[in-house]
Amino acid sequence: APTSSSTKKTQLQLEHLLLDLQMILNGINNYKNPKLTRMLTFKFYMPKKATELKHLQCLEEELKPLEEVLNLAQSKNFHLRPRDLISNINVIVLELKGSETTFMCEYADETATIVEFLNRWITFCQSIISTLT
């Protein structure tokens, strides 16, 4: 059974992941630029199911495309540095799901915009944090 300290660590990591995803979404929502329209044309794969930490494999597999889309947004008004941000998220995801995981991600048939994608993973973090609180 997980110890209270490991639960606390998991909760903190999930909170960090949640904040990073919220920061990206806030940056995009604040973004007044023709590039935003282009960003919304990129399609992301959504998990068929995302209820456990192992399902973060699906997020990990989409981090490279996410970085590529965020690179489009670089300007003086977009304060997220994609390489640092994605690297940080990647570290958290690996720690949360475990690097030994052999879980194969199953994706939904429908793809999503970056906003829908971020909202899905934000909801995932929030629901798991709620069960740990």
């Epitope: 903190l12 960090h16 904040l19 990073d20 919220q22 920061m23 979404l25 806030n26 929502n29 304060h79 997220l80 540095r81 640092d84 941000l85 690297s87 940080n88 934000i122 929030q126 709620s130 609180t133």
Partner: antibody, heavy 113, light 107 residues
């Protein structure tokens, strides 16, 4: 103990910039993201933005975008909030808060000609 | 942005009274709600997080309830040190937003 200590009160002229510091102690600096919140005299609380203290990236409220810059110095466990093009409406107490349960004492910034 | 509306904006009560403050979100925020107490010239103090969890060291006379859009902060028996302004806050989505505050005054 865990605490955030902010720099002292500032008086600035309209159009100038102000840089407020917030020094963390008693915990691992990179463990909690830092928010900045301000409160104008007799008014409520207003979120300005957030900084990830480990990687240094930020996200700001739309109202402050283009005027606010949040930075950090991991060697001194300090975060900074700089607000430019000051106007009288920016007169407020500025707070840093780590994880929402630990707050700095606040820094009064007065903008007056 | 999610709007947070508190009511009442002020209230007068006596020591020993039961006090209830409500907060309504403009959209569902699940239980991503916190309550703060602020005294003049001081920083806000976290009382309740996750809608109903009491922060460390906060007296048990404070309690929070609700989920979705409607939330309540209750002080079961008002003490002299409880006269202050109380704020609700959502952290469900950025930008983080606060209610306009409820000032609890001595009757």
């Amino acid at each position: 103990q865990v605490q955030l200590v902010q720099s002292g009160a500032e008086v600035k002229k309209p159009g100038a910039s102000v840089k407020v510091s917030c020094k963390a102690s008693g915990y691992t600096f990179t463990r909690y993201y830092m928010h900045w919140v301000r409160q104008a005299p007799g008014q409520g609380l207003e979120w300005m933005g957030i900084i990830n203290p480990r990687a240094g990236y930020t996200s700001y409220a739309l109202k402050f975008q283009g005027r606010v810059t949040m930075t950090r110095d991991t060697s001194t466990s300090t975060v900074y909030m700089e607000l430019s093009s000051l106007r009288s409406e920016d007169t407020a107490v500025y707070y840093c808060t780590s994880g929402w349960d630990v707050w700095g004492q606040g820094t009064l910034v007065t903008v007056s000609s | 942005d999610i709007q947070m509306t508190q009511s009442p904006s002020s209230l007068s009560a006596s020591v020993g009274d039961r006090v209830t403050i409500t907060c309504r979100a403009s959209q569902s925020i699940s239980t991503w709600l916190a309550w703060y107490q602020q005294k003049p010239g001081k920083a806000p103090k976290l009382l309740i997080y996750a809608a109903s969890s009491l922060d460390e060291g906060v007296p048990s006379r404070f309690s929070g309830s609700g989920s979705g859009t409607d939330f309540t902060l209750t002080i079961s028996s008002l003490q002299p040190e409880d006269f202050a302004t109380y704020y609700c806050q959502q952290s469900y989505s950025f930008p983080v937003t606060f209610g306009q505050g409820t000032k609890v005054e001595i009757k």
